[in-house]
């Protein structure tokens, strides 16, 4: 009966359009066969969450429809990606990992990873 | 405001039931875990159990299980403790708390006295 | 499951004094370590997160360090609206335990 430990990378750079993704791993203490995985976004100590999945061992993270996240898994690893994002969501993504079913209940939250994001340029006026 | 506000305890003999209420206000119930925890006169804090946001996870103290039942209502932002068997060591204060983004107990009700004697 | 140890039962302060208080586990809740005060007749409230971290609103004279097994809360300056009971609890894992509190009371 351990911590659970949760790896995620610490720093990332969104896309041109506003895609990041990252690797949230994490040491499972128990034989887990549900697991949630939520994104909580810290901004100014302030916590929210960004999206969250619950999924069974060996099948696809299931996303709600309206939800700016996807992602897969892999065992002990999901692959976490972030659509939709602009410079004004640069801040610290946290990947928080709970081991629902069977009991006992297991908490995992990782460091956080900080996610910059550059609007890009708008393309210049062409006069051909 | 974040409120909660326990409801439902009383005397009852041993043996006897009861069921507590917990009215949630002031944010979105249905995104949070629950749950409950007791406080024995003098004594000090005991986790009792714990429900997820959806209900599809529930969890107990050892010291509780087969007797009481947690649940929950989102529709009406409202939390439950069905509590049968009743013995003279569930006597305590129970509150209600609210599972906090990153794990701890973040918002509590004021507690509701719950006897059991005869 | 995991037991936290809360040492001394209580312990006497003078306002303005630093107080520290310990908390130890059976066995290793990483950081998932929670601190609240409760005053007599009230309901708890949360005041250290995560070993380190303070909930919203919550004084920076209340500090809390440590991982693992050893944890430390400290209270830089007491008030006295800070005498009262104060207890560590882990979150890390089913089932949730708390420590059995220690008494800051006035010297």
């Known amino acids: 009966c351990k911590a659970m430990h949760v790896a995620q990378p610490a720093v990332v750079l969104a896309s041109s359009r506003g895609i990041a993704s990252f690797v949230c791993e994490y040491a499972s203490p128990g034989k887990a066969t549900e697991v949630r995985v939520t994104v909580l976004r810290q901004a100014d100590s302030q916590v929210t969450e960004v999206c969250a999945a619950t999924y069974m061992m060996g099948n696809e993270l299931t996303f709600l429809d309206d939800s700016i996240c996807t992602g897969t898994s892999s065992g002990n690893q999901v692959n976490l990606t972030i659509q939709g994002l602009r410079a004004m969501d640069t801040g610290l993504y946290i990947c928080k990992v709970e081991l629902m079913y069977p009991p006992p209940y297991y908490l995992g939250i990782g460091n956080g990873t900080q996610i910059y994001v550059i609007d890009p340029e708008p393309c210049p006026d062409s006069d051909f | 405001e974040v409120q909660l506000v326990e409801s439902g305890g009383g005397l009852v003999k041993p043996g006897g039931s009861l069921r507590l209420s917990c009215a949630a206000s002031g944010f979105t119930f249905s995104s949070y875990s629950m749950n409950w925890v007791r406080q024995a006169p003098g004594k000090g804090l005991e986790w009792v159990s714990s429900i997820s946001s959806s209900s599809s996870y529930i969890y107990y103290a050892d010291s509780v299980k087969g007797r009481f039942t947690i649940s929950r209502d989102n529709a009406k932002n409202t939390l439950y403790l069905q509590m049968n068997s009743l013995r003279a060591e569930d006597t305590a204060v129970y509150y209600c708390a609210r599972v906090g983004l990153m794990g701890p107990f973040d918002i509590w009700g004021q507690g509701t006295m719950v006897t059991v004697s005869s | 499951e995991i037991v936290l140890t809360q040492s001394p039962a209580t312990l006497s302060f003078s306002p303005g004094e630093r107080a520290t208080l310990s908390c130890r586990a059976s066995?290793?809740?990483?950081?998932?370590l929670a601190w609240y005060q409760q005053k007599p007749g009230q309901a708890p409230r949360l005041l250290i997160y995560g070993a380190s971290s303070r909930a919203t609103g919550i004084p920076d004279r209340f500090s809390g360090s440590g991982s693992g097994t050893d944890f430390t809360f400290t209270i830089s300056r007491l008030e006295p609206e800070d005498f009262a009971v104060y207890y560590c609890q882990q979150y890390g894992s089913s089932p949730f335990t708390f420590g059995p509190g220690t008494k800051v009371d006035i010297k």
């Open positions: 066995q290793s809740v990483s950081s998932y």
